[in-house]
């Protein structure tokens, strides 16, 4: 309902708003203040999203999908603010919203294009499948389809069999890379160009270490300083691979500065941790300690994996007893 009077028609302008799944957003709309304000928000020019006139909301004909999800900035309407507060956006909310505002002297039309993105924190995993070693970059829920970049020693490479499953809401993506026998460094970047958000996984293989039984081993884990910042929340996990699966030896949470140690022979140097050095010592080695040791430093923005191979050999004494 617009007042029947002489009014100026102001041509439409268009804005893009980018929202994140399940978060609240504001669809902006402003007008030159005036009396007898009427505001109608519509979706794709047909579904009624929100209506306001005669000083209050009139939501009788509001489309059910918007029930309890929209409101105006009521104290600011008289100042020319017709913006819509929109709760818990979903991917189904994407599209064009039109705001029609009428006052005693003019009618204005504002178009807002809503785009919705999803980006759940990805992960980088190291897996053994029979005799093959794989790095897998995966993201459980992402929208729109992300750009995935693999690099070997800082040069882009092709990964050949990305697994992608699409649902109504988003994509789930697994990108495996066979790294069997390689000692190169690898990097995987997953980029959501709509949300302007990226995540990077890095994998570095250290030279193999040969140790004698009952000696101790020192395994380094120092993040390179381009991505890593000690001011951000992160988690460090040391694990050992046994018969194809990793068991956690210890972990550290930066938020609480807590260290949890599951293996009594494992030690971490608190002073080194304070200097962002997560190298560890394993004392009194025995033959069953041979294997792969993985240091995983993870935050919302990256995963840094460092892998060491340790070979424990029988000491001379043990060998002569046999």
């Amino acid at each position: 309902i617009f007042p029947l009077a002489f009014f100026i028609y102001v041509p439409m302008n268009e804005q893009i708003v980018i929202g994140r799944l399940d978060e609240d957003i504001i669809l902006p709309s402003s007008f030159e203040r005036g009396s007898e304000v009427v505001i109608h928000w519509k979706y794709q020019d047909s579904y009624k999203v929100h209506s306001y006139y005669k000083g209050s909301d009139h939501l009788e004909s509001q489309d059910p999908r918007y029930a309890n999800r929209t409101s105006l900035f009521y104290n600011e309407i008289q100042n020319g603010n017709a913006s819509l507060f929109f709760r818990r956006v979903s991917l189904l909310d994407e599209g064009i919203y039109t705001c029609y505002v009428g006052t005693a002297i003019q009618v204005i039309t504002n178009k807002v294009v809503l785009k919705v993105g999803v980006f759940l924190t990805p992960v980088m995993k190291y897996e053994k499948r029979n005799t093959n070693s794989f790095l897998i970059c995966s993201v459980l829920s992402v929208y729109p389809r992300p750009i995935i970049t693999w690099k070997m020693d800082n040069t882009p490479i092709s990964e050949n069999n990305m697994e992608e499953t699409g649902s109504l809401d988003s994509f789930s993506i697994n990108s495996p890379l066979n790294i069997t026998g390689s000692n190169s460094s690898y990097e995987c970047t997953i980029e959501n160009s709509l949300l302007k958000q990226t995540w990077t996984g890095r994998w570095t293989m250290k030279d193999g270490l040969h140790k004698m039984q009952s000696e101790h081993v020192s395994l380094s884990c120092q993040p390179v300083n381009d991505y890593f910042s000690p001011n951000q929340d992160f988690k460090v996990t040391w694990s050992r691979m046994k018969s194809g699966t990793f068991s956690v030896l210890a972990y550290y949470l930066s938020s609480s500065q807590n260290t949890i140690i599951n293996e009594s022979r494992f030690s971490w140097n608190k002073e080194l941790i304070n200097q962002s050095d997560f190298s560890m010592n394993l004392m009194d080695l025995n033959l069953s300690d041979s294997g792969e040791y993985l240091c995983n430093i993870s935050s919302d923005e990256y995963t840094l994996l460092t892998i060491h191979t340790v070979h424990v050999e029988p000491s001379q004494e043990t060998a002569s007893h046999n």
């Epitope: 693999w150 040069t155 092709s158 050949n160 910042s229 923005e301």
Partner: antibody, heavy 119, light 111 residues
């Protein structure tokens, strides 16, 4: 909205140094990288390098390694580029530009700082 | 360094028709999944503006009349139908390996 506001035009003598600034607003400064790009009058664009404000890590185009130095001040969301041992070849417009972490294209640019090197 | 060669150096296209700008790199800058080529538009007295990233992905807010394609060493920017406001210089840029370089630019004039 995202904005990169660069410092004003500079006039410098050969051999001198200048330091220009790029103040970011409308986004989380430490979540993106700042790249610097050179454009000589009537010519194309040259990538100088970038700084990661969160960690102060820098990467330079070899050509500019001894010419440019990047710094960043997180508290004021400002990135800086210092150019040393100036010659007439350094006369150009210098842009700062925002880049996503790990992605080497530039989605927002400053308006540019014009540097004139003249005796 | 990777050299990007743009052609033509300049072109004039009638309003409403198609403009095609080519960018050729001195070595391949794509994998089987991604082309590491990006396109920018620069108007006089203004900074460049991102149009397309990774060969074919339109930046949010850029009109759909802009499109990109290509792989390996050959990439193309298409503008159809051209509008008066598309008068500008267009640059390609690769992000394959350091240092990242730009093409020499193509100046587009609308007739």
């Amino acid at each position: 909205q995202v904005q990169l506001q660069q410092s004003g035009a500079e006039l410098a003598k050969p051999g001198a140094s200048v330091k220009m600034s790029c103040k970011a607003s409308g986004y989380t400064f430490t979540s993106f990288w700042i790249h610097w790009i050179k454009q000589r009058p009537g010519q194309g664009l040259e990538w100088i390098g970038y700084i990661i404000p969160n960690t102060d890590y820098t990467e330079y185009n070899q050509k500019f390694k001894d010419k440019a130095t990047f710094t960043a001040d997180k508290s004021s969301s400002t990135a800086y580029m210092q150019l040393s041992s100036l010659t007439s070849e350094d006369s150009a417009v210098f842009y700062c530009a925002r880049g996503l972490r790990g992605a080497y294209y530039f989605d927002y640019w400053g308006q540019g700082t014009t540097l004139t090197v003249s005796s | 360094d990777i050299v990007l060669t743009q052609s033509p150096a300049s072109l004039a296209v009638s309003l409403g028709l198609r403009a095609t700008i080519s960018c050729r790199s001195s070595q391949s800058v794509s994998t089987s999944t991604n082309g590491y080529m990006h396109w920018y538009q620069q108007k006089p007295g203004q900074p460049p503006k991102l149009l397309i990233m990774y060969a074919s992905n339109l930046e949010s807010g850029v009109p759909a009349r802009f499109s990109g394609s290509g792989s390996g060493t050959d990439f193309t920017l298409n503008i159809h139908p051209v509008d008066e406001e598309d008068t500008a210089t267009y640059y390609c840029q690769h992000s394959w390996v350091l240092p990242y370089t730009f093409g020499g630019g193509t100046k587009l004039e609308i007739k």
